[in-house]
Interface confidence: low
């Protein structure tokens, strides 16, 4: 109970996941890869390993650069964060998977769900990632 939680600079997760509907649209927010900036003084710049498809704003929000149907070729990519002063670099994997239709969802209600998912309202054309404890 007297434990002190130490802040670790970098991405708090090894992999960020988002469940999306098939049609991804230009400007659609996909998920937030929040970087843990412990002293608050670091100026971090984000970069995507697939800049033609995914872009990251200064808040770590990842969104689609263009419209495309989600497929296995877009399913995994990397996000890099770089300290502008020290040039120190961190990376994290992003995994996108297809959201089942509502019909499929009702059948799979009892199936185990990943911890990080889009609630129903974050779908096809919209949404930022939210943590949901299951």
């Amino acid at each position: 109970s007297g434990e002190i939680a130490l802040c670790k600079t970098g991405f708090p997760e090894d992999v960020y996941s988002a469940v999306l509907s098939k049609d991804v649209h230009e400007g659609q927010p996909l998920l937030n890869v929040k970087f843990s900036n412990c002293n608050g003084k670091r100026k971090v710049q984000y970069e995507s390993s697939e800049p033609a498809d995914f872009k990251v704003d200064e808040d770590g929000m990842v969104y689609a650069v263009r419209s495309f149907p989600l497929s296995s070729e877009h399913a995994k990519f990397l996000i890099y964060a770089q300290d502008k002063e020290t040039q120190e670099k961190w990376q994290v994997a992003v995994k996108l998977s297809l959201k089942p239709t509502l019909t499929e969802e009702s059948v799979k209600e009892s199936a185990e769900v990943e911890e990080i998912v889009f609630p129903r309202q974050f779908s096809k054309h919209s949404g930022h990632l939210q943590r949901q404890k299951r």
């Epitope: 098939k22 129903r120 309202q121």
Partner: antibody, heavy 115, light 106 residues
């Protein structure tokens, strides 16, 4: 209950501009795109464009570029569409629509352009 | 832009009759959406992702298709189904609508 409440009917003169609103309630405004759709009397539906209120990204149908400007105000959960240089061709009902599957529609704003 | 052509433009059906209307896209799309609109009312989402019925839509409705060709079917026409039905694609902007099929009671 999710609702998209649109502003009332407008009667404006040719050459003028008009700004109509669409107030969202019952859901998190920034969670959905807001689409705008035009319907002329007795005719079909025409997609104007959308605004993503979360990051203020807009996408327009080329046909409406320069005619329509989409904006939003997160604090009041309201989307706006301004139409400029109005002519009789712009007389129509304008709908806002949003939701996970575009399943929420406003009641429509009737715009009449007449001298 | 992707032009959606709906046919027929107008059709009439007797109560209990099976009804099928189609929507053809000039370019292939991933999914089709359908809306129902009655006179002086806002459109209502009717079918999403080609074949999923929106909440409250009777199960006599169904949707199918892929690529360039999609259809909406009513297994047994009822009076409340008289309306105009529009298809819409979300695969590439502009998110075009079809010109609509007006369904009347015979």
């Amino acid at each position: 209950e999710v609702q998209l409440q649109q502003s009332g009917p407008e009667l404006v003169k040719p050459g003028a501009s008009v700004k109509m609103s669409c107030k969202a309630s019952g859901y998190t405004f920034t969670s959905y795109l807001m689409h705008w759709v035009k319907q002329k009397p007795g005719q079909g539906l025409e997609w104007i464009g959308y605004i993503n209120p979360y990051i203020d990204v807009t996408k327009y149908n080329e046909k409406f570029k320069g005619k329509a400007t989409l904006t939003s105000d997160k604090s009041s959960s309201t989307a706006f569409m301004e139409l400029s240089s109005l002519t009789s061709e712009d007389s129509a009902v304008y709908y806002c629509a949003g939701g996970d599957y575009e399943d929420y529609w406003g009641q429509g704003t009737t715009l009449t352009v007449s001298s | 832009e992707n032009v959606l052509t709906q046919s027929p433009a107008i059709m009439s059906a007797s109560l209990g009759e099976k009804v099928t209307m189609s929507c053809r896209a000039s370019s292939s799309v991933n999914y089709m959406y359908w809306y129902q609109q009655k006179s002086d009312a806002s459109p209502k989402l009717w079918i999403y992702y080609t074949s999923n019925l929106a909440p409250g839509v009777p199960d006599r409705f169904s949707g199918s298709g892929s690529g360039n060709s999609y259809s909406l079917t009513i297994s047994s026409m009822e009076g409340e189904d008289a309306a105009t039905y529009y298809c819409q694609q979300f695969s590439s902007p502009p998110f075009t609508f079809g010109s609509g099929t007006k369904l009347e009671i015979k």
